[in-house]
């Protein structure tokens, strides 16, 4: 029966007489007055089992004591850590000449268990032990035991197991205890492979390559690899694993990803949040599911968010030039969270009866730049029929509308080819200037062609440089343009519409918005 | 059983000498030193010294040198306390007891029935 | 050479009852000492030995702790037959006994 005492983990103990409760019951030779199983209590007030001898009046002291049979368990080399006390001879009146200070120490590779006689000349000898102290006594009356630990290996081993032997040659020693052990290095996580128990090699400088296993839901990198050194260490890990898609390192092992995180590809990367507009709904996700009404694009990353179809540009602005017509719009209000957006142009040729009756267009009708996949806010379309309705539509588009097509992403115009629109608007005045309007007042167009039916404002900050301008429509030669920034400059054009479509916009007129209302006015040119 | 026999009573007159046997059995008489303790009558305990039995080197204490000699004859395996020049001071109980060394202390465990010498003139 | 003292001289306790005896160095000793008991007549018997070691057939009513210059030999239960004289021995390189405690019948 042995109690169970704390080793380092690299350490394997195959014998350790301080765990035996009992005794040793070793066998000593000769039997009577060499060495003797003796009790003594430790710092702990235990008893502890020890072998002592003191036979320093004597010479030629040839007292041996020998352990049971300890199994090998594999091990190549095992080390024997012996804790001694041994008296200082000098303490000793009158024995000078007998007493000794070593003694020795010795081994015998067998695969018998039960050799019953000591048979000195089977045994090897591993060294002559000194201590590093001796003592006049041994105070252990405060229970502090003063004792030298000296530690020999011996390898290679092959037989099943070993016997040790203890020669005393006339020393006054006591063995206070004796652990054989052999050295592993113990089972291991390192950079997700799992290297197993391995006993260390036959030499002191010997190394022994381990191949190491992915652990659970991980796959191979490089092979990893690692060597196991003579101390016990394990040295030079080489190689690793990688986590599975789904699955993160966490203390060494790879745990499924948490429900709402997702890692798409076996990386060493931790899990992510599920992008914005996604879920998952189970653990070990690889990818997050898009929320309802958001796509993802064939070529989008798993870490990109979902995204949906633009809403439907704005402001559709139509000039028609005979038989050609210039269709200018701004960017959609929602771009569905997606840079790719483009557009493209839908035409259609209705009947001057029934305008529900269209049909396409065809191929004689030119586009410039293109028809489709514009990234311009522009068009200009030739070679239509004269005296003809058309219906142009401008169609949003995104790397995911192709999921989700809706007349939500477009925005339409008809017109009517090779009738005269009205020429431009010569004089644009600025009436009244505040922080944040201004009054705008123009003239009828020297040339009508027709009753006009309305007049339209074109306007935007002078700094925005007509990427995002605003419309306003009114039938008045008049207008009063509100919600302006103060100390701004902005820029106005104006054009009339006719049956016949619309002319061509005015020459700008800047004007720049006030601290101090001011009645200011534009001569058609620049404005402050 | 290991015993330690040591002779009778010793009447001796001022400066004569006597020789106290101690014979022992029941062990190696080599393998154990032997000590010799006086207690004067009344008195307590004092240690005199001791003598390897195997080589035969004694160890006096501080005050038995020179009058007192120990000896031995190991063929029947005994220990000698011989006293010259005896004095009245020297009466008293002389033991004979076996040395018993360990790493952890030494003591004296088995003891002779003692000697009595008296010295009167 | 180092002088032992044991204390006290004489010590009175009944059968049964619990005995502490003392016994002090002069200077520090490396060990235990080793205590003899001797009733009248006989010779001293070896009760206990190093690292507080009873000798052969000493009953376990006897223990010795101590270290250092203060050394207690304790008789747990005093039986009839304990009652003698206890002496403390130093050993080194010359052994001294001390001048003993004489356990008595109260």
């Known amino acids: 029966v042995t109690g169970s005492r704390v080793y380092p983990a690299n350490e394997v103990t195959l014998l350790d007489s301080r765990s035996v409760q009992g005794e040793l019951g070793w066998i000593a030779s000769p039997l009577e007055g060499g060495w003797e199983e003796v009790s003594i209590m430790d710092e702990k007030n235990t008893p502890i089992r020890t072998y002592q001898v003191c036979n320093v009046m004597e010479a030629s002291q040839n007292n041996w004591l020998r352990t049971d049979w300890i199994t090998r368990e594999g091990a190549q080399r095992v080390y024997i850590e012996i804790k001694f006390t041994l008296r200082d001879c000098n303490s000793l009146p009158g024995v000078m000449g007998t007493c000794k200070e070593t003694f020795n120490l010795y081994y015998y590779e067998s695969d018998n268990d039960k050799e019953r006689f000591i048979r000195e000349s089977q045994f090897g000898k591993i060294d002559t032990i000194a201590a590093d102290e001796s003592f006049t006594q041994v105070d252990i009356g405060d229970r502090i035991m003063k004792l030298n630990t000296e530690i020999r290996d011996v390898g290679p081993l092959s037989k099943k197991g070993f016997y040790l032997a203890f020669q005393d040659v006339g020393a006054c020693i006591a063995l206070v205890s004796v652990r054989v052990f052999y050295k592993k290095c113990p089972l291991t996580v390192r950079n997700l492979a799992q290297f197993p128990d391995t006993i260390t090699g036959a030499d002191t400088s010997s190394l022994v390559e381990v191949r190491g296993s992915c652990v659970n839901n991980s796959e191979e990198k490089d092979v990893p690899k690692m060597y196991c050194g003579a101390d016990g260490e394990w040295l030079v890990p080489i190689g690793n694993c990688l986590c599975n898609a789904g699955h993160e390192e966490q203390n060494g092992e790879c745990q499924a990803c948490k429900i709402g995180y997702y890692k798409a590809l076996s990386t060493d990367a931790s899990c992510a949040k599920c992008p914005p507009h996604s879920y998952s709904v189970w653990e070990g996700a690889t990818s997050c599911t898009c929320d309802r009404g958001f796509f993802r694009a064939d070529n989008d990353a798993a870490s990109m968010p979902c995204t949906r179809p633009p809403s439907a540009p704005l402001n559709l602005i139509s000039n028609v030039n005979e038989t050609s017509v210039n269709l200018e719009w701004s960017s959609p209000q929602n771009t569905g969270g997606r840079q790719d957006i483009s557009y493209n142009v839908v035409c259609k040729k209705c009947g001057a009866g029934d305008p529900s009756k269209c049909r396409p267009c065809g191929s004689g009708v030119h586009y410039t730049p293109q028809q489709n996949g514009l990234k311009t806010t522009r068009v200009s379309i030739t070679d239509l029929l004269a005296h003809t309705n058309y219906t142009f539509e401008i169609w949003a588009v995104n790397g995911v509308s192709k999921y989700n097509p809706s007349p939500d992403q477009s925005v339409s115009v008809t017109v009517t080819t090779n009738q005269a629109a009205p020429s431009s608007i010569a004089l644009v005045q600025a009436k009244e200037v505040t922080r944040y309007s201004v009054a705008l007042a123009w003239l009828e167009p020297d040339r009508p062609n027709g009753v006009i039916l309305e007049y339209e404002v074109k306007y935007y900050e002078k700094d925005q440089n007509e990427r995002s301008y605003r419309i306003v429509r009114t039938a008045a030669r008049n207008t009063d343009i509100k919600g302006l920034n103060p100390l701004t400059s902005y820029v106005f054009h104006v054009r009339a519409r006719t049956a016949a479509g619309y002319g061509d916009f005015s020459e700008p007129l800047e004007v720049t918005t006030n601290t101090v209302p001011s009645r200011i006015i534009g001569d058609g040119a620049n404005s402050t | 059983q290991v015993q330690l026999l040591q002779s009778g009573a010793e009447v001796k007159k001022p400066g004569a000498s006597v020789k106290v046997p101690c014979k022992a059995s029941g062990y190696t008489f080599t393998s154990r030193a032997m000590s010799w303790v006086r207690q004067a009558p009344g008195q307590g305990l004092e240690w005199m010294g001791w003598i390897n039995t195997n080589t035969g080197n004694p160890t006096y204490a501080q005050g038995f040198t020179g009058r007192f000699v120990f000896s031995l004859d190991t063929s029947v395996s005994t220990a000698y306390l011989q006293i010259s020049s005896l004095k009245a001071e020297d009466t008293a109980v002389y033991y004979c007891a076996r040395v018993r060394l360990t790493v952890y202390g030494d003591g004296m465990d088995v003891w002779g029935q003692g000697t009595l010498v008296t010295v009167s003139s | 050479e180092i002088v032992l003292t044991q204390s006290p001289a004489t010590l009175s306790v009944s059968p049964g009852e619990r005995a502490t005896l003392s016994c002090r160095a002069s200077?520090?000793?490396?060990?235990?000492p080793p205590w003899y008991q001797q009733k009248p007549g006989q010779a001293p018997r070896l009760l206990i030995y190093?690292?507080?070691t009873r000798a052969t057939g000493i009953p376990d009513r006897f223990s010795a702790s101590g270290s250092g210059t203060d050394f207690t030999l304790t008789i747990s239960r005093v039986e009839p037959e304990d009652f003698a004289v206890y002496y403390c021995?130093?050993?080194?390189?010359?052994?001294?006994f001390g001048q003993g405690t004489k356990v008595e019948i109260k």
């Open positions: 200077q520090s000793v490396s060990s235990n």
């Open positions: 021995q130093q050993y080194g390189s010359s052994w001294t």
């Open positions: 190093g690292a507080s």
